[in-house]
């Protein structure tokens, strides 16, 4: 049976993005001049509405390559573009609980 997707907020949202996006990182910090449109988007979607893994994937900094798309050059971001790196505190077990909720 179809089950509505879950909401993710705060650190749980960050950790889940961290796992989904891996080395690619993801759009995270607020630029000095204005809120990042992507950042605002994922908060509105995932925390205040509902979220699934496919949506999370769209916020990764560099799109995942598919086998059919090996020629596409990687996305190049400016050096100062805010991305969230894989953190030393990230815990797989904690993320696994979150992603299991999203998969159900």
């Amino acid at each position: 049976a179809y089950r509505p997707s879950e909401t993710l907020c705060g650190g749980e949202l960050v950790d889940t993005l961290q796992f989904v996006c891996g080395d690619r990182g993801f759009y995270f910090s607020r630029p000095a001049s204005r809120v990042s449109r992507r950042s605002r988007g994922i908060v509105e979607e995932c925390c205040f509405r509902s979220c699934d893994l496919a949506l999370l994937e769209t916020y990764c900094a560099t799109p995942a390559k598919s086998e059919r798309d090996v020629s596409t050059p990687p996305t190049v971001l400016p050096d100062n573009f805010p991305r969230y790196p894989v953190g030393k505190f990230f815990q797989y077990d904690t993320w696994k609980q979150s992603t299991q909720r999203l998969r159900r």
């Epitope: 907020c9 705060g10 650190g11 960050v14 809120v35 205040f48 904690t94």
Partner: antibody
Framework: EVQLLESGGGLVQPGGSLRLSCAAS???????IMWWVRQAPGKGLEWVS?????????LYADSVKGRFTISRDNSKNTLYLQMNSLRAEDTAVYYC???????????????WGQGTMVTVSS | DIQMTQSPSSLSASVGDRVTITCRAS??????LNWYQQKPGKAPKLLIY???TLQSGVPSRFSGSGSGTDFTLTISSLQPEDFATYYC?????????FGQGTKVEIK
């Protein structure tokens, strides 16, 4: 100077209503997720509600869900909390606070107002 | 909901003492733990976020550590202005919850 200033508190009878306001200054209000947190006399802190930077998303603690409504007017740099069907247990100092991060509270609340006292009593 | 438990609930210390306050979460919260200081009649003040990051303007005598479920706030050398109540808060998910507070009093 970055500042939040609450107003609208007071004495109200059980079942009554009150609207709190929080005026923001010194920063770009529309860029920030905003919060209401309360503290009953002599007690600890309790999260009440949060609103997204655009105002399009809101969340509430179970204790106030269906009775309180958070909103904001970015053109006026003001956050609101409409409180209906008030109960004695809602008696507290109500603080507005600014989110320190981007993903809803993950870095805590960095700027707080001075608080406004709400007393629910007959 | 994630429950946050602080210990001790109160402590007495002297100026210059090293003070340690602990906070335990009822489930793993990674490093999403914040510490606040509150003085009587005043709003809370953010000291440390994500377990160990010192908020801008906070003196370096404050430090935080821990991950998972166990966290610590340390004041390396207690100053007169540090006598206050300290709260931990988990920012891992909703509902965002606080510890019950630790009151640091003058011995």
């Amino acid at each position: 100077e970055v500042q939040l200033l609450e107003s609208g508190g007071g004495l109200v009878q059980p079942g009554g209503s009150l609207r709190l306001s929080c005026a923001a200054s010194g920063f770009t209000f529309s860029n920030y997720i905003m919060w209401w947190v309360r503290q009953a006399p002599g007690k600890g802190l309790e999260w009440v509600s949060v609103i997204s930077s655009s105002g399009g998303g809101t969340l509430y603690a179970d204790s106030v869900k269906g009775r309180f409504t958070i909103s904001r007017d970015n053109s006026k740099n003001t956050l609101y909390l409409q409180m209906n069907s008030l109960r004695a247990e809602d008696t507290a100092v109500y603080y507005c606070a600014r989110d320190n991060g981007d993903y809803v509270g993950e870095k805590g609340f960095d700027i707080w107002g001075q608080g406004t006292m709400v007393t629910v009593s007959s | 909901d994630i429950q946050m438990t602080q210990s001790p609930s109160s402590l007495s210390a002297s100026v210059g003492d090293r003070v340690t306050i602990t906070c335990r979460a009822s489930q793993s919260i990674s490093n999403y733990l914040n510490w606040y200081q509150q003085k009587p009649g005043k709003a809370p003040k953010l000291l440390i976020y994500t377990a160990s990051t010192l908020q801008s303007g906070v003196p370096s005598r404050f430090s935080g550590s821990g991950s998972g479920t166990d966290f610590t706030l340390t004041i390396s050398s207690l100053q007169p202005e540090d006598f206050a109540t300290y709260y931990c808060q988990q920012s891992y998910n909703s509902p965002w919850t606080f510890g019950q507070g630790t009151k640091v009093e003058i011995k």
